[in-house]
């Protein structure tokens, strides 16, 4: 079958109440079939490519475990399995300040060097 292109799928927006939790869905496709090398998953806030990171994890070659390296205030947790092309993120104990746009990003390293980030992101509405 032909190689897939890079793409990311996120909903336009997610709504939740302050104090509750929210899930920010993000799935992706990539052209590197059977890739099992090092992988980094990143979520950032505000703007794509340049906004501050709120979550980052890394998986070693051959591992499904994406070890958390950054979780702002300990409130961000990866639900999706990046090896299954899912970067869905759970945000706990929502505050009004979390009301902003979030962008998911995946990076491949090792034999393959490639990366992709959602351009439009998902808008989190906190009420």
């Amino acid at each position: 079958s032909p190689a897939q292109r890079w793409s990311m799928q996120v909903p336009p927006e997610v709504s939740a109440e302050a104090g509750d939790a929210a899930v920010l869905p993000c799935t992706f496709t990539h052209p590197h079939r059977h890739y099992d090398g090092p992988l980094t998953a990143i979520w950032r806030a505000g703007e794509p490519y340049a906004g501050p990171q709120v979550f980052r994890c890394a998986a070693a070659r051959g591992s499904e475990l994406c070890q958390t390296a950054l979780s702002l205030h300990g409130r961000f947790r990866l639900l999706g399995n990046p090896r299954r092309n899912d970067l869905s993120l759970r945000v706990e104990r929502l505050a009004l300040a979390d009301d902003r746009r979030y962008f998911c990003r995946v990076e491949f390293a090792g034999d393959v060097h490639d990366r992709y980030e959602s351009r439009h992101g998902v808008r989190l509405h906190v009420t």
Epitope: T27, R33, H34, Y35, D36, A60, R61, G62, S63, E64, L65, Q67, L78, L79, G80, N81, R83, R84, N85, D86, S88
Partner: antibody
Framework: QVQLVQSGAEVKKPGASVKVSCKAS????????VSWVRQAPGQGLEWMGV????????GYNEKFKARVTITADTSTSTAYMELSSLRSEDTAVYYC??????????????WGQGTLVTVSS | DIVMTQSPDSLAVSLGERATINCKAS??????VDWYQQKPGQPPKLLIY???NRYTGVPDRFSGSGSGTDFTLTISSLQAEDVAVYYC?????????FGQGTKVEIK
């Protein structure tokens, strides 16, 4: 051939801790994730957590996060699962399982024989 | 957590007949479902991975299908050695979660 051999059955009192071992052979231990899965008597399977022995990184089911610790010793190719503050509902068979990999697909391809942990006063 | 619901809970099938087990995920898990067989006193054994791929050494009477939220394990011609409990498991989200199991017996 790949083998996972677990430690023997344990009987513990409520409030105590138990540490179950899983000795791997037949493959390069640091390269593959090892998960722990439990099964209460007559019940289904429940994933508890995972370790990547090469990095020592761990991930846990939130249900057990406060009570479980998974470790690995690459020098002896052994993974460990310690569960604390035991209660009667923790009575179960505990399995270790290797997360195998083939062409970008992961799966539990080899399992330990299981360790029965009984919690009783 | 993702809830995996199997149906039926138990199934009695005549030797040589077809057995079908269904598994429904509480949300989309792509094709990331595996099937395991467990016999009494033994650990689970992998049959099918990634919804449709038969694991090495598994007889071709076992097949899997489905994606999204609905998955099926089919035993095309039940043999005596297939008496066991069968579990589906999703690995798209953490924590990994299993179905409650389906017991297959001979009628």
């Amino acid at each position: 051939q790949v083998q996972l051999v677990q430690s023997g059955a344990e009987v513990k009192k409520p409030g105590a801790s138990v540490k179950v071992s899983c000795k791997a052979s037949g493959y390069t231990f640091p390269r593959y994730d090892v998960s722990w899965v439990r099964q209460a008597p007559g019940q289904g399977l429940e994933w508890m957590g995972v370790i990547h022995p090469g990095s020592g990184g761990t991930g846990y089911n939130e249900k057990f996060k406060a009570r479980v610790t998974i470790t690995a010793d690459t020098s002896t190719s052994t993974a460990y699962m310690e569960l604390s503050s035991l209660r009667s509902e923790d009575t179960a068979v505990y399995y270790c399982a290797r997360r195998g990999l083939n062409s970008g697909y992961w799966f539990f391809d080899f399992w330990g024989q299981g360790t029965l942990v009984t919690v009783s006063s | 957590d993702i809830v995996m619901t199997q149906s039926p809970d138990s199934l009695a099938v005549s030797l040589g007949e077809r057995a079908t087990i269904n598994c429904k995920a509480s949300q989309n898990v792509g094709s990331n479902v595996d099937w395991y067989q467990q016999k009494p006193g033994q650990p689970p054994k992998l049959l099918i991975y990634e919804s449709t791929n038969r694991y090495t050494g598994v007889p071709d009477r076992f097949s899997g299908s489905g994606s999204g939220t609905d998955f099926t394990l089919t035993i095309s011609s039940l043999q005596a050695e297939d008496v066991a409990v069968y579990y589906c498991m999703q690995s798209n989200f953490f924590p990994f979660t299993f179905g409650q199991g389906t017991k297959v017996e001979i009628k």
